[in-house]
Amino acid sequence: SWMWNQFFLLEEYTGSDYQYVGKLHSDQDRGDGSLKYILSGDGAGDLFIINENTGDIQATKRLDREEKPVYILRAQAINRRTGRPVEPESEFIIKIHDINDNEPIFTKEVYTATVPEMSDVGTFVVQVTATDADDPTYGNSAKVVYSILQGQPYFSVESETGIIKTALLNMDRENREQYQVVIQAKDMGGQMGGLSGTTTVNITLTDVNDNPPRFPQSTYQFKTPESSPPGTPIGRIKASDADVGENAEIEYSITDGEGLDMFDVITDQETQEGIITVKKLLDFEKKKVYTLKVEASNPYVEPRFLYLGPFKDSATVRIVVEDVDEPPVFSKLAYILQIREDAQINTTIGSVTAQDPDAARNPVKYSVDRHTDMDRIFNIDSGNGSIFTSKLLDRETLLWHNITVIATEINNPKQSSRVPLYIKVLDVNDNAPEFAEFYETFVCEKAKADQLIQTLHAVDKDDPYSGHQFSFSLAPEAASGSNFTIQDNKDNTAGILTRKNGYNRHEMSTYLLPVVISDNDYPVQSSTGTVTVRVCACDHHGNMQSCHAEALIHPTGLSTGA
C-alpha cells in the first residue's frame, strides 16, 4: 500500500534549490531500484518533479497560492522490468500554504457616486469593496479594514463594510458640487505591517429644489400691433433658478391685471422662458395699454424647504397696443340672397355693407370680383352696395350663384376685404311637362276592350313648392271616335286602354295617339306627346309574334281612325 499523508507547501518560496515537497513510497519498495515512481496530473514534470527511484517530490518553480491553491496529482509505482504496477494508481493532494503577499484591491480604480445636496448626516452614498486574494480562512492576511484618507469632514467610511456616508450637515450643491474622496483598504485587520490599496471616489451632489425662481427685473414692457392674431408672441420674460433640471423648471402664469383675458403666457420648455402671447383680438380704438401681473413658480416643490419661503416670484408686464390701418369690415361674414328666375334686368336683389374700423372711418367702394361672375349676370352699386341683375336668370340652368364682393377703402386702395354672396334663384313655372321617355307600344289583334297596353310617366324641369301634379288626356282632335282611351291615374301617371274588341293589322297596322300633359301650377304649362301603337299578331298568352314595321317610317301626326 501507499505510505504518505497530504503534502503542504509554502507559497512564494525564494530559496536557490528546488523546494522539497515530500516522498511517495510504496511498502512494496525493497530499496533495490526495481521500482519506478511516476507522477502525473496538475503540473507533473513541470512544476513538480519526482525522483523515479526514491519517490522524492520537489517543486521546480515558485508557487502562488492565489493562482492555484491545490494541486491534484496521481502516483504510480511500477516494476521497472515488467511495467507491472505494484500499487493501484492513487490520487494525492499538494496544498499551498498562504503568506500575506497580496494587498487588498478595490473592485474599481475609481468609483462615481451621487448623493442629494442638503442630505442628513449619515446618509448612504456608496459602498466600496476591496478584495484580498490571500487565504481568508487562515490568519488575517485577507481581513480588510477601510479608512478615509481624503474627504473629511464631508464624508466618513464604515471600517468593516466600506459604506461611505455623509458627515456634514447642509452641504449645498450651489456652493460646491464635486468632492474627491480617497479610501484605503488595509489587510491584517488594519494592523501594522498590513498591505494596503486605495481607491478614489468621485462624489457629486445632486440637486434638490432648495432655491426659488427670481425675476431679474420687476417690470417688463412690450409693444404689439392691434392686428396681431391670437397666438402671436409679443415678448419673452425669464426668471432664473439656481437649481438644475426639473428643480429649475419654471411655470409662468398671469395672475392679475386688466389684460388677464386678452393675453396668455406659455412656458418654453427648452429655454424656460415665459412667452407672452395674444389671446383675443386687440383693438387699438378700444384700448391702447394693458397691464399684467405674471408669476414664475416651480412646479415641483419639496415640502421640507418651504420654510425658506414661497417658491415663486412675480413681475409686472406692460403691453402697448399699436395702431394699424385695417381693411373694411363687412356687416356679415357671408350674405344669402334670393331672386325669382323671371326677374327683369336691373332688378335689385339686396345689399351689402362694409365699414372702415379705423378711427378715420375712411369711405369704401364696392365691386364684384369678376373671377366669380364671368358671365356678368350681377352688378353692384359701388356707392351703396346694392346688388342687381344685369342678365336674365334661369333656375333650371343654375340654381345657386356664388359670387364675391370686394369692399375697398377709397383713400387707400390697398386696404380691401372680400365677402361671399350666395344668391338662390327661385322657381317660376316656365316649363311644360313632357313624356319621361319615347313611348312605342303594341296591341294584340285579339285584344279585349278596356285592356291596359301602356303606362305613361311625365317629367317637368320646374320645381314647384308643393310638388308636381300632372294631368293626362287625349288631344281634343283625337278624342272623338278614338280606338283607345287615356285613363289619368291621378298619381302623375296615366294608362292607355283599348276601346274595342279586336284589331286588324291588315286594315290598320299602326296608331299614333296625341296625348296632352298639363301641370297644376301658375301659369299652367302643357305639351302634346305622341304614343305609337302597333297592331301585332300574338299567341294565346298575349306574347307578340309579328308586327308590320311600316309604323317606324310614318310621319309624325294623326293616323286616320285613331
Epitope: G33, S34, T82, G83, P85, E89
Partner: antibody, heavy 117, light 111 residues
Amino acid sequence: EVQLVQSGAEVKKPGSSVKVSCKASGYTFSNYWMHWVRQAPGQGLEWMGDIDPSHSETHYTQKFKDRVTITVDKSTSTAYMELSSLRSEDTAVYYCARGDLGRFDYWGQGTTVTVSS
Amino acid sequence: DIVMTQSPDSLAVSLGERATINCRASESVSIHGTHLMHWYQQKSGQPPKLLIYAASNLESGVPDRFSGSGSETDFTLTISSLQAEDVAVYYCQQSFEDPWTFGGGTKVEIK
C-alpha cells in the same frame, strides 16, 4: 541517440558455443534491462532472457535455462549472450533489445548465427 | 506460460482502407488498470519496431493512423488508413509474467 550495435554473423558447428555482444550508447546503461530475443528463419519472435546491468540480476526462459548465459560489462556498456551446446535448430537471428517497463523500445540490428556441420 | 494467439495469420487490405489485427492472451495481462500488452512492426530484413505500449499508448514518432485498444485477454491493433509503407509482420507481446511471450505474427499486405 540510443544505439545498440551487435557483433557480426557467426557460423558454428553443432555442440559448440557462440557468444554475441551488444554495445549500448546514448543512454545510462545501468538504468535499463537488456533483453535477448531470437527469430528462426521465417518464424516468429522468441524471448530468451534479460539482465539488470546495475545488479547483474538475470531471468531466463525455461527452454534455454541450462544453455544460455547473459552477462554485462558495465565499463564498456556491453551486454553478452552465450548459447552453448548448439544444434541446427539454434540457427536464427539473435537480437538484443533495451527493456523499459516491459516493452522493447530499442533493438540491435541482429546477429545471424548459423549452426551447420 | 501465457500463450498469445494472433488472428488472422495474414491480411490483404486495399490502400487507404482499415486493417484490424487481434491478439488473445490465454489469461489476463491487466493489473490495476494497466494492460501489459505491446505491439511491434517488423519489416523484411529489419529488427522489430515498437508501435504501441501498454495496450493503447502510441510510441513517440509513430504515425497516428496506428492505434491500440483492449483489456484483460483481448487486444486489437488498428491501422485506420493503410499506406504502402505499412506492409510488414505485426507482433503482440505480453510482459505480465515470465517468460515474456510473443504472438505468432500477422502478415499485412496490399490487396
